[in-house]
C-alpha cells in the first residue's frame, strides 16, 4: 500500500540558476487531487521550497511568488526551480500526497542533489 516516489539522484543547474527534474510516483489509489511539495534538506534540517495542489489532468499551479513551476502528465510531475545560487546547492526532496478521494497516501523520494555553480563574471573588455 505504500507509495513509491522516484526522482533523479543528481541534477546540475544551468548557468542561469535553473534546475529541472522529473518526480514520478506509483499511485496505489485512484486519486483525483494530488499535492506535490519540494523540500530542501540541509544539515538534517528540512524546509519547504514550494508546493502545489492539482487535479489529475490539470496543470500544477504554484503561488505567484514561488520559485517553482511545473507540469504534470499522469503520475509524473516535471518540476523546475529557478533563481538558484551556489549557496542553494543541496538535496531537494519530492513529496507527493494523494489528497482526494480518501484514503490519503504519502510518498517521499530519496531526493535530488542539485548542484549550482555561480557563473563567473565576464571579464572587463579593453
Amino acid at each position: 500500500k505504500a507509495m513509491h516516489v522516484a526522482q533523479p539522484a543528481v541534477v546540475l543547474a544551468s548557468s542561469r540558476g535553473i534546475a529541472s527534474f522529473v518526480c514520478e510516483y506509483a499511485s496505489p489509489g485512484k486519486a483525483t487531487e494530488v499535492r506535490v511539495t519540494v523540500l530542501r534538506q540541509a544539515d538534517s534540517q528540512v524546509t519547504e521550497v514550494c508546493a502545489a495542489t492539482y487535479m489529475m489532468g490539470n496543470e500544477l499551479t504554484f503561488l505567484d511568488d514561488s520559485i517553482c513551476t511545473g507540469t504534470s502528465s499522469g503520475n509524473q510531475v516535471n518540476l523546475t526551480i529557478q533563481g538558484l545560487r551556489a549557496m542553494d546547492t543541496g538535496l531537494y526532496i519530492c513529496k507527493v500526497e494523494l489528497m482526494y478521494p480518501p484514503p490519503y497516501y504519502l510518498g517521499i523520494g530519496n531526493g535530488t542533489q542539485i548542484y549550482v555553480i555561480d557563473p563567473e563574471p565576464c571579464p572587463d573588455s579593453d
Epitope: 505504500a2 528540512v46 524546509t47 513529496k95 484514503p103 517521499i108
Partner: antibody, heavy 122, light 107 residues
Framework: EVQLVESGGGLVKELLGPGGSLRLSCAAS????????MNWVRQAPGKGLEWVSS????????YYADSVKGRFTISRDNAKNSLYLQMNSLRAEDTAVYYC???????????WGQGTMVTVSS | NEVLTQSPGTLSLSPGERATLSCRAS??????LGWYQQKPGQAPRLLIY???TRATGIPDRFSGSGSGTDFTLTITRLEPEDFAVYYC?????????FGQGTKVEIK
C-alpha cells in the same frame, strides 16, 4: 518555542438517547500554523494511541477514523492559530486524553500538545 | 487498515543495557514509520521518522532500522530517563495507525 496547548476537556454525562457534546481547542504558537496539517489523537486510560482526525493546512482535506465519523468534526482557524474538535453524541468509549499533534514536513507527528482529558460517564 | 504489532509487550532491563524493540506491519509501509516515546502523564515525543532518521534533539543512543514490514528501535545503553512506553506509527496512508506499545521497565 514551538507549542501546542489543548483545552476544553471535561466530564460529560452520557444520557439515554443522543450523548452529550464537547468542543476541544488547541492553541498553536512558535511556528507558522497555516503551513501545517494538524491531527487529533486520543488515548483511553491505560491504553495505546488512537488517531482520531486530520485536517490539511487550508482545511481543504479532512479525514476521520471510522470510530468517530459522523459524530466528530475537525476544523481550524488559521487567523487565530487554533485547531478544534467538535464532539457530538459522546459515548463512554470516547473517554480519553485528547492530544493535538502537528504533521511534520516529512510526515510523522512531530509536535504534540500536553493533552486534555474527556470523560464520558453514564 | 494497516495493523502494527509491537513486541515484546514489556521489556525488563537494567540501566546500561541494550533494548531492542520490534514493530511489524500487516503490509508494507515502506519507510513511512515513526517511533515515539511516552512517559507517564506526558505527551508522546517523536524519536525516529523515516524508519531510521533521528528527530531533532534525540540522543544518538536511539537508532531505528528496517523497511517494508519489519522495523526495530534500538537503545544502545539505557539511561534512567529512557524507561517509558514506546509506540511505532505508520504515516504512509490513512487511517494513521499506531502499535499497541512496548513498555521498557527497570528490572
Amino acid at each position: 518555542e514551538v507549542q501546542l496547548v489543548e483545552s476544553g476537556g471535561g466530564l460529560v454525562k452520557e444520557l439515554l438517547g443522543p450523548g452529550g457534546s464537547l468542543r476541544l481547542s488547541c492553541a498553536a504558537s512558535g511556528f507558522t500554523f497555516s503551513s501545517y496539517s494538524m491531527n487529533w489523537v486520543r488515548q483511553a486510560p491505560g491504553k495505546g494511541l488512537e488517531w482520531v482526525s486530520s485536517i490539511s493546512s487550508s482545511s481543504s482535506y479532512i479525514y476521520y477514523a471510522d470510530s468517530v465519523k459522523g459524530r466528530f468534526t475537525i476544523s481550524r482557524d488559521n487567523a487565530k492559530n487554533s485547531l478544534y474538535l467538535q464532539m457530538n453524541s459522546l459515548r463512554a468509549e470516547d473517554t480519553a486524553v485528547y492530544y493535538c499533534a502537528r504533521v511534520g514536513l516529512m510526515g510523522p507527528f512531530d509536535i504534540w500538545g500536553q493533552g486534555t482529558m474527556v470523560t464520558v460517564s453514564s | 487498515n494497516e495493523v502494527l504489532t509491537q513486541s515484546p509487550g514489556t521489556l525488563s532491563l537494567s540501566p546500561g543495557e541494550r533494548a531492542t524493540l520490534s514493530c511489524r506491519a500487516s503490509q508494507s509501509v515502506s519507510r513511512y514509520l515513526g517511533w515515539y516515546q511516552q512517559k507517564p502523564g506526558q505527551a508522546p515525543r517523536l524519536l525516529i521518522y523515516g524508519a531510521s532518521t533521528r528527530a531533532t534533539g534525540i540522543p544518538d543512543r536511539f537508532s531505528g532500522s528496517g523497511s517494508g514490514t519489519d522495523f526495530t528501535l534500538t537503545i544502545t545503553r539505557l539511561e534512567p530517563e529512557d524507561f517509558a512506553v514506546y509506540y511505532c506509527q505508520q504515516y504512509g496512508s490513512s487511517p494513521w495507525t499506531f502499535g499497541q506499545g512496548t513498555k521498557v521497565e527497570i528490572k
